[in-house]
C-alpha cells in the first residue's frame, strides 16, 4: 500500500511530512531534513532516516565471533549526505572540512582526513551480526520458536526477504541475529539490510520508526523479549582500511 | 476493513462443550492472532486466551485444563472450545484482534455473542 | 498470575469535571529496554464491545478525543477525563499485557 489515503500519514516512516499534492491528490510524503519523497510501501533508507533525526528537534560456542574487520558505530550520530536515491555518499565531510569514507551503512571505514580524502566507492557492507542480551526470564526462550518468530519480524515487519537473515543465534541471554546480502544477491525493490537493521535497532530501543502506537512489542509464545544491550557488528564486501595507530 | 464475527449456539447445557467461531475478514491470519474475552452478564472482562500469528497459543490459567483455541486459515476461522461447562462460563463472548508487533492490544473486537449454560 | 486493581468501582462527575480513575498492578508493567509500560485503557458502552483508548500506558490512540489522558509507569497507572461529556458514560478498564493479560475490575463513569 502507499501513504494512508485517509489521513495520509507514511506507516513506514514518522519522519515524514505528507500532503495530499501528488498524481491525482494521492498521498505524498517527503522525508524530514532531505525532502525527498519516499515510497511509504517500504523501508525509507538510512541515510534518510539519519538526516531526518539530525534535523529534527533535540530532546561463545554457538554465538559468532566478529570477524577482526568488524565495524561497530562508535562514532555515532552525524548529519549525512545522501545521494538522490536516499544512499550514503561514500565520503562525508562535517562542517570543519573533516572528512571521511563511510559504507553502506553509513559507518566509517577510514582513518579522518581533511577535504582531500578521496572515497572512490561507496562499499557495501554484506553481513550484519546484530548482537542483543535480554533481560532474564523465568527460563530460556525456546531457540526454534525464537528463531520463527524473530524471522518473522524481519519478513512482516521490515520486509526483509527470508533468505537474507542467515542465522539466528541464541545461548541465553544473548542472541544473534545475522544478516547476508551480497550485491549481486539484491534484487531490484530487496530491502536492504542495513536498513532492516536500523529499524530493528530503533524498534528495541523503543524509538520506533513506523508510524502508530510507538514501540515494539516482541512475544516468543507469549512472553515479552525485553533486549537490555544491543550491538552492531558490520562486515564491508572489502576490508576497511584505518591506520595501525587506531588498531593500538 | 478489518472484521472479527463470533458464532456459536446461544444455549449450552451443563457438562456440554461451549463451541465457538471467530470469522475474520480485512488482516492475514498469518501476520496477526486472535484473541478470546469474555463477560457474564452484568460483570467484567475476563481473557480467556490466546493463538498468535505463528500458531502458538497461550491460555488463561484458571480455564486451561478446559480450554482449546484453533484456528483454520482457509476459512479465516479461529475456534475456541471450553469442555465441562457450568452456569458460571454464562457470558457474552468476544473474540478480538492482536495487534502484532505494535503491542498485544485489542483494537479491534467482533460485537459478541451471548452464550447461556442452562438446562 | 499478574492482579490488577481498579479504584473506584464507580464515580459520579458533572458535566466538564475532571474524573480519574487510578489503576495497581501487583507487578511493574515496565519494560526496561524500552522503558514503555505494558498498560491499555478501554472504553466500554452498554451492549457494545470495549474499545481502546490508549495504550503502552500513555499512547492515545487515533481518534480519540484528547480530553482522555493516561498517566504512571511501574505499578501506578491513571487515565483521565479532563472535562466529562456526557458521551464519556461509560465502564473504563485497565489491561496489563506484560505476562499475558489480566483487566482491571472496571469503573463505572456516571453523571452527577
Known amino acids: 500500500h502507499t501513504a494512508a489515503q485517509d489521513n495520509c500519514t507514511c506507516p513506514t516512516n514518522k519522519m515524514t511530512v505528507c500532503s495530499p499534492d501528488g498524481p491525482g491528490g494521492r498521498c505524498q510524503c517527503r522525508a524530514l531534513g532531505s525532502g525527498v519523497a519516499v515510497d511509504c510501501s517500504t523501508l525509507t533508507s538510512e541515510c534518510l532516516l539519519l538526516k531526518a533525526r539530525m534535523s529534527a528537534p533535540k530532546n561463545a560456542r554457538t554465538l559468532v565471533r566478529p570477524n577482526e574487520h568488524a565495524l561497530v558505530d562508535n562514532d555515532g550520530l552525524y548529519d549525512p549526505d545522501c545521494d538522490p536515491e536516499g544512499r550514503f555518499k561514500a565520503r562525508q565531510c562535517n562542517q570543519t572540512s573533516v572528512c571521511w569514507c563511510v559504507n553502506s551503512v553509513g559507518v566509517r571505514r577510514t582513518d579522518k582526513g581533511d577535504l582531500s580524502l578521496r572515497c572512490d566507492e561507496l562499499v557495501r557492507t554484506h553481513h550484519i551480526l546484530i548482537d542483543l542480551r535480554h533481560r532474564p526470564t523465568a527460563g530460556a526462550f525456546n531457540h526454534s520458536d525464537l528463531d520463527a518468530e524473530l524471522r518473522r519480524l524481519f519478513r512482516e515487519r521490515y520486509r526483509l526477504h527470508p533468505k537474507f537473515v542467515a542465522a539466528v543465534h541464541y545461548e541465553q541471554p544473548t542472541i544473534q541475529i545475522e544478516l547476508r546480502q551480497n550485491t549481486s544477491q539484491k534484487a531490484a525493490g530487496d530491502v536492504d539490510i542495513g536498513d532492516a537493521a536500523y529499524y530493528f535497532e530503533r524498534d528495541v530501543k523503543g524509538e520506533s520508526l513506523f508510524q502508530g502506537r510507538g514501540g515494539l512489542d516482541l512475544r516468543v509464545r507469549g512472553e515479552p523479549l525485553q533486549v537490555e544491550r544491543t550491538l552492531i557488528y558490520y562486515l564491508d564486501e572489502i576490508p576497511p582500511k584505518f591506520s595501525m595507530k587506531r588498531l593500538t | 476493513q478489518v472484521q472479527l464475527q463470533e458464532s456459536g449456539p446461544g444455549l449450552v447445557k451443563p457438562s456440554e462443550t461451549l463451541s465457538l467461531t471467530c470469522t475474520v475478514s480485512g488482516f492475514s491470519l498469518t501476520s496477526y492472532g486472535v484473541n478470546w474475552i469474555r463477560q457474564p452478564p452484568g460483570k467484567g472482562l475476563e481473557w480467556i486466551g490466546v493463538m498468535w500469528a505463528g500458531g502458538s497459543t497461550n491460555y488463561n490459567s484458571a480455564l486451561m485444563s478446559r480450554l482449546t483455541i484453533s484456528k483454520d486459515t482457509s476459512k479465516n476461522q479461529f475456534s475456541l472450545k471450553l469442555s465441562s461447562v457450568t452456569a458460571a462460563d454464562t457470558a457474552v463472548y468476544y473474540c478480538?484482534?492482536?495487534?502484532?508487533?505494535?503491542?498485544?492490544?485489542?483494537?479491534?473486537w467482533g460485537q459478541g455473542t451471548l452464550v447461556t449454560v442452562s438446562s | 498470575d499478574i492482579v490488577m486493581t481498579q479504584s473506584p468501582d464507580s464515580l459520579a462527575v458533572s458535566l466538564g469535571e475532571r474524573a480519574t480513575i487510578n489503576c495497581k498492578s501487583s507487578q511493574s508493567l515496565l519494560n526496561s529496554g524500552t522503558r514503555k509500560n505494558y498498560l491499555a485503557w478501554y472504553q466500554q458502552k452498554p451492549g457494545q464491545p470495549p474499545k481502546l483508548l490508549i495504550s503502552w500506558a500513555s499512547s492515545r490512540e487515533s481518534g480519540v478525543p484528547d480530553r482522555f489522558s493516561g498517566s504512571g509507569s511501574g505499578t501506578d497507572f491513571t487515565l483521565t477525563i479532563s472535562s466529562l461529556q456526557a458521551e464519556d458514560v461509560a465502564v473504563y478498564y485497565c489491561?496489563?499485557?506484560?505476562?499475558?493479560?489480566?483487566f482491571g475490575g472496571g469503573t463505572k463513569v456516571e453523571i452527577k
Open positions: 478480538a484482534r492482536d495487534e502484532n508487533w505494535d503491542g498485544a492490544w485489542f483494537a479491534y
Open positions: 489491561k496489563q499485557s506484560y505476562n499475558l493479560f489480566t
